[in-house]
Amino acid sequence: KEVVLLDFAAMKGELGWLTHPYGKGWDLMQNIMDDMPIYMYSVCNVVSGDQDNWLRTNWVYREEAERIFIELKFTVRDCNSFPGGASSCKETFNLYYAESDVDYGTNFQKRQFTKIDTIAPDEITVSSDFEARNVKLNVEERMVGPLTRKGFYLAFQDIGACVALLSVRVYYKKCPEMLQSLARFPETIAVAVSDTQPLATVAGTCVDHAVVPYGGEGPLMHCTVDGEWLVPIGQCLCQEGYEKVEDACRACSPGFFKSEASESPCLECPEHTLPSTEGATSCQCEEGYFRAPEDPLSMSCTRPPSAPNYLTAIGMGAKVELRWTAPKDTGGRQDIVYSVTCEQCWPESGECGPCEASVRYSEPPHALTRTSVTVSDLEPHMNYTFAVEARNGVSGLVTSRSFRTASVSINQTEPPKVRLEDRSTTSLSVTWSIPVSQQSRVWKYEVTYRKKGDANSYNVRRTEGFSVTLDDLAPDTTYLVQVQALTQEGQGAGSKVHEFQTLSTEGSANMAV
């Protein structure tokens, strides 16, 4: 932004500048250019020997300026365009200035003036241009400063040129008031802080409803000596509930929200929220809908799922496979997990209790993502009730639970009672028994054995009787032995694992039971 202190051309000849010597040299004249009257100060004493003609401006109030710019528009005639070349003719003039705190009026003293520069034209007006009225306009600019007094004068010294001053414009530069990145920067006088620091750092203030982002830098700009803003640093962002519209922050419209200071616009309230008011930072959930703590505010409100569908319990001897399908209503969430709980009841007494400790699940039962699980180590002659609960991220926000139950009765055999009948260095004779009432249901017995400490291999023998001799064993070696009844329904309960040791080659009649 240029703040003009003096503009000769704009004054249409009304500025009465001082000429010295009076009535000679510089002269105010009017001409017609492009059918418009223009005014100029002109001098053309090119054949009268040495010249020293001065033209002084009126006193100019400095205002806030420290450095001023002087723009001159002028024309200079070619000395060769005059007959005989006009021997004393010059093609330059001198520019001066003087500072003062008061207007000296018509009291003009050359010694008070300091030379700024010799002003020379880039283009001179030759005869053909002059005759054709082609004004060869030169534009020269000079900077003066720092200024310290209340005002100043400019003066133009003619030393024998044929020159016309068409425009004298004096101005200083300001960086204009500016909005940048939602920050307002004040109008700032363009001034170099020092020779090494040609930029003035100016702090901006965030516009209404804008803030400096958390941990970010406040807005800064640099005002150059040329009155231009450079290098923005930092920024402001529209605060929560407001969005950027051009250079301002506007409250979110009803039905929209913005939860944090950011560059993003207000978002439409998501599904299952109540309509927000103007300037909302969030949208409340409808009744029965919730937000998990980790849910972004832009996400729809959700609710707990309904119970799993079609829970089935398939008994397989001492095992049960539980299968179910996903809930019909997921509550609008993908983060569904299932929990399985187990209750056992003794048929004789009707007594019931939890059975998590005595059964074994094929995978941990409390954050299942699959829709099936196998439960083993079930006791015979026991009624089991399994509950499968569907949960999602908002289930913890309500007291009600969504589950489905399935019951199963375990009618499998009791585990066989196993003992060591005999042993040698290379064999073990094992016998077992089960209650007579259950014997009819047993199809065969499965004997599993392996060396203790050897998890990689085991042997299986099947028999219809109640005993088996395990041959080809290693002397003086402990074996792990388990017997399990096989029924039409599948595997029955297995015995506990027994440790039996073969005799050493030295021989001993002692038996380990």
Epitope: M40, T125, C162
Partner: antibody, heavy 128, light 107 residues
Framework: EVQLLESGGGLVQPGGSLRLSCAAS????????MAWVRQAPGKGLEWVSR????????HYADSVKGRFTISRDNSKNTLYLQMNSLRAEDTAVYYC?????????????????????WGQGTLVTVSS | DIQMTQSPSSLSASVGDRVTITCRAS??????LAWYQQKPGKAPKLLIY???NLHTGVPSRFSGSGSGTEFSLTISGLQPDDFATYYC?????????FGQGTKVEIK
């Protein structure tokens, strides 16, 4: 010394035509703006037309526009005025006049010109 | 067009007198004004251009002044050779116009 010598004047009937010439010497003709100025008997001076050093631009007084044509031949150092559709009010002494910007000690040329050098004139009489 | 009005249209003066002739323009012409001298049966001669600039070879007793619409030609000490008719001419417009003339006669 600058010399301008007009010729071609004489008696002509209304509606007739005449061509005036102005022979120049003693200066560089091609540098000068040239003009015709007339003076009716016992009256003041009236500017008629002008032509630039290279043959343009040309300007005419309203009273002669469309009837008179100014021209020049720089190779012959001669200025011309072709006068057609002559009227009684065109009766006057016709002067050829010149202007050299080199002798105009001003920084910016005036909107038009004045006349530094004049010929002795030639009389044109339009009468039936 | 700009009208130029001279006054007086004629005047009688003696040798040595100071004589002033005025010229008024119908609108401002800045200083774009010339003065000419014409003797009977002769061509006009340029005296002054740009209101106050003396043409080469013109005696210094002739001077011009004024700007805008009011101009004057002054002969500071009238000489026998100065008895003639004087014309002003504006050249602020392409339709250059002359005043009607002022005749300076011997008293």
């Amino acid at each position: 010394e600058v010399q301008l010598l007009e010729s071609g004047g004489g008696l002509v009937q209304p509606g007739g035509s005449l061509r005036l010439s102005c022979a120049a010497s003693g200066f560089t003709f091609s540098h000068y703006m040239m003009a015709w100025v007339r003076q009716a008997p016992g009256k003041g001076l009236e500017w008629v037309s002008r032509i630039g050093p290279s043959g343009g631009p040309t300007h005419y007084a309203d009273s002669v526009k469309g009837r008179f044509t100014i021209s020049r031949d720089n190779s012959k150092n001669t200025l011309y005025l072709q006068m057609n559709s002559l009227r009684a009010e065109d009766t006057a002494v016709y002067y050829c006049a010149g202007y050299d910007s080199g002798y105009d000690y001003v920084a910016v040329a005036g909107p038009a010109e004045y006349f530094q050098h004049w010929g002795q004139g030639t009389l044109v009489t339009v009468s039936s | 067009d700009i009208q130029m009005t001279q006054s007086p249209s004629s005047l009688s003066a003696s040798v040595g007198d100071r004589v002033t002739i005025t010229c008024r323009a119908s609108q401002s012409i800045s200083t774009w004004l010339a003065w000419y001298q014409q003797k009977p049966g002769k061509a006009p001669k340029l005296l002054i251009y740009k209101a106050s600039n003396l043409h080469t070879g013109v005696p210094s007793r002739f001077s011009g002044s004024g700007s805008g619409t009011e101009f004057s030609l002054t002969i500071s000490g009238l000489q026998p050779d100065d008895f003639a008719t004087y014309y002003c001419q504006q050249y602020n417009q392409y339709s250059r116009t002359f005043g009607q003339g002022t005749k300076v006669e011997i008293k």
